[in-house]
Interface confidence: medium
Amino acid sequence: LQDLCSNCPAGTFCDNNRSQICSPCPPNSFSSAGGQRTCDICRQCKGVFKTRKECSSTSNAECDCISGYHCLGAECSMCEQDCKQGQELTKKGCKDCCFGTFNDQKRGICRPWTNCSLDGKSVLVNGTKERDVVCGPSPADLSPGASSATPPAPAREPGHSPQ
């Protein structure tokens, strides 16, 4: 009798009430593997969740988070709120970045501004809570009497090493 059940394909279940006939999964349920004795209830994407993929007889629904939230956990089991640029999400909610740090995204944590002097450069544009500093030419390049025969190197993007 066990062999009869193993013949039931995904999308069906082995119905003990009907002499182990393979019955289709009822509406709003699925079986992703063969030989199942029951079908699993489809996940419902509601509230803060929205449907990314509808449930089928062989696969569960997949959820995303609505605008203003992003997924956390396995298979988007939770939705975490977005913050504004210039903020980071702590366990107690969105908090502004501390002075000297920035976040240019709606998620993630605040990161320290680039230290231009480590590369021998000067600060061309000051950093803000939302943006990193922009590094410019070295202070020596800007001093009076410095040769202007060669233009200063272009400012590199933060986080990229010089070639």
Partner: nanobody, 124 residues
Framework: EVQLLESGGGLIQPGGSLRLSCAAS????????MTWVRQAPGKGLEWVST????????YYADSVKGRFTISRDNSKNTLYLQMNSLRAEDTAVYFC?????????????????WGQGTTVTVSS
């Protein structure tokens, strides 16, 4: 494989009590802080409580302070959340989570493992 399995959720009347458990496996339980987080229907994640690896330090969200108690039994690899004086607004899916250090962090980004969640419904 690191796993967290919550249990103890259910339907409870306002003013009632429930105790949630989270059975941990696959890691040295006492070496890591543990956290309870919840998600109410139609809302985002809300941090509930965190306990250090040793169990000496506990932290609570203002919304549950004085009503909920977090604890852990490191000999049984189990985390608990005792919930008293339950209110309708406590209705949520409760997730237990492992932090990546022994001390509590301010961030969700220090959480590296999540449980699947257990549903608590507070209704008369």
């Amino acid at each position: 494989e690191v796993q967290l399995l919550e249990s103890g959720g259910g339907l409870i009347q306002p003013g009632g009590s429930l105790r949630l458990s989270c059975a941990a496996s696959g890691f040295t339980f006492s070496s890591f802080a543990m956290t309870w987080v919840r998600q109410a229907p139609g809302k985002g994640l809300e941090w509930v409580s965190t306990i250090s690896g040793s169990g000496d330090n506990t932290y609570y969200a203002d919304s549950v302070k004085g009503r909920f108690t977090i604890s852990r039994d490191n000999s049984k690899n189990t985390l608990y959340l005792q919930m008293n004086s339950l209110r309708a607004e406590d209705t949520a899916v409760y997730f237990c989570a492992k932090e990546d250090t022994a001390v509590a962090s301010d961030y969700y980004y220090n959480i590296d493992v999540w449980g699947q969640g257990t549903t608590v419904t507070v209704s008369s």
